[in-house]
């Protein structure tokens, strides 16, 4: 039994890191393999992650971690019984994929303005809380070409757009994702989408 693709890990910069790897043949990850991990820290202890299958030869492990700080470094040991298959390390702050924003809501009762709000996925004491920026994706269910992205580069988790920038009388969906420039993170997954019917009063034509 050998590792074909070494484990690569990403952290949510809070409490979970996800490691994926591939073996050289079909493997029952949960019965045959164990990923041991330990924070390099005086008061830490070793933990064991039981991997799940991720395709025939692929394995994935979800590592429960202490609250992350930038200096953290974890040792990783992949075992098959008594055989050490791979040894490595992982710095969560260098491989961050933020959590997805939540609670996306479209407020349509503010005159002819659409107000989209969502929740920051981090608690205020987490470093990423004040460093996330967002992308909001709005698309029409009726017209695949009507697809737009709004970049929200300020910290407030909200976006205002004029209802008239979208077509009236049809349904739209929106979703939002996050990233943090400070740690050069990847984008988060998209939030669950929310749907609304866009309608607004057409302005009277002037003759």
């Amino acid at each position: 039994m050998k590792v074909l693709q070494e484990p690569t890990c990403v952290s949510d910069y809070m409490s979970i890191s996800t490691c994926e790897w591939k073996m050289n043949g079909p493997t029952n990850c949960s019965t045959e393999l164990r990923l041991l991990y330990q924070l390099v820290f005086l008061l830490s202890e070793a933990h064991t992650c039981i991997p799940e299958n991720n395709g025939g030869a692929g394995c994935v492990c979800h590592l429960l971690m202490d609250d992350v700080v930038s200096a953290d470094n974890y040792t990783l040991d992949l075992w098959a019984g008594q055989q050490l298959l791979w040894k490595g390390s992982f710095k969560p702050s260098e491989h961050v994929k933020p959590r997805a924003p939540g609670n996306l809501t479209v407020h349509t009762n503010v005159s002819d303005t659409l107000l989209l709000t969502w929740s920051n996925p981090y608690p205020p004491d987490n470093y990423l809380y004040n460093h996330l920026t967002y992308a909001v994706n709005i698309w029409s269910e009726n017209d695949p070409a009507d697809f737009r992205i709004y970049n929200v580069t300020y910290l407030e988790p909200s976006l205002r757009i004029a209802a008239s920038t979208l077509k009236s009388g049809i349904s739209y969906r929106a979703r939002v994702r996050a990233w943090a420039q400070c740690y050069n993170t990847t984008w988060s997954e998209w939030s669950p989408s929310t749907k609304w019917h866009n309608s607004y009063r057409e302005p009277f034509e002037q003759h």
Epitope: S15, V40, F41, L42, L43, S44, E45, M65, D66, D67, V69, S70, A71, D72, P123, D125
Partner: antibody
């Protein structure tokens, strides 16, 4: 908002015992190492003890064998049991959250050891 | 045990002046594990700098940290009235644990 509130300080005779408590709120206590740091009157800061998320502990040489740190994750509380107290243990005792350094501190509780 | 020695013991300066505080370690310290704190009378310490040079959230940019190995520096570019306090450096070591310097008092001249 992160809050750490110490209690249990007071006047104790040399050789006596005292138990300090720290009530934590505003963060996930179970995922954080916790510490006690003290400061004698007019002196500098001295790290006393720390406890990891899994219960691993460490002590300064000056308190080893006399002090015991513990935590109760269900109650979001940190404790310091201090036995065989000496005059030189007189200090303000701070509860702190952190790891390699300490971003969050309580306001401290004063322990006075005197006959 | 790693010993941190801060100098000077007291720094007498006027508002608007630049303050340079030194912290010297008895053996090499990882920059990742070097921090600076500010403490005012009757208050708990406040983290200013971690990782030798990263400002903690909410700390004004007049505070900066630098250094590596055994020599570290905290600089306050222009002293404000609220900056007069005692400053401590602190290190962490995987085997020796946590130690603080003895402090530098920055007082009004």
């Amino acid at each position: 908002e992160v809050q750490l509130v110490e209690s249990g300080g007071g006047l104790v005779h040399p050789g006596g015992s005292l138990r300090l408590s720290c009530a934590a709120s505003g963060f996930t206590f179970s995922r954080n190492a916790m510490f006690w740091v003290r400061q004698a009157p007019g002196k500098g800061l001295e790290w006393v003890s720390g406890i990891g998320t899994g219960g691993a502990t460490s002590y300064a040489d000056s308190v080893k064998g006399r002090f015991t740190i513990s935590r109760d994750n269900a109650k979001n509380s940190l404790y310091l049991q201090m036995n065989s107290l000496r005059a030189e243990d007189t200090a303000v005792y701070y509860c702190a959250r952190g790891r390699y350094y300490f971003p969050w501190w309580g306001q401290g509780t004063l322990v006075t050891v005197s006959s | 045990e790693i010993v941190l020695t801060q100098s000077p013991g007291t720094l007498s300066l006027s508002p608007g002046e630049r303050a340079t505080l030194s912290c010297r370690a008895s053996q090499s310290v990882s920059s990742s594990y070097l921090a600076w704190y500010q403490q005012k009378p009757g208050q708990a310490p406040r983290l200013l700098i971690f990782g030798a040079s990263s400002r903690a959230p909410g700390i004004p940019d007049r505070f900066s940290g630098s250094g590596s190995g055994t020599d570290f520096t905290l600089t306050i570019s222009r002293l404000e009235p609220e900056d007069f306090a005692v400053y401590y450096c602190q290190q962490y070591d995987h085997s020796a644990g946590w130690t603080f310097g003895q402090g530098t008092k920055v007082e009004i001249k």
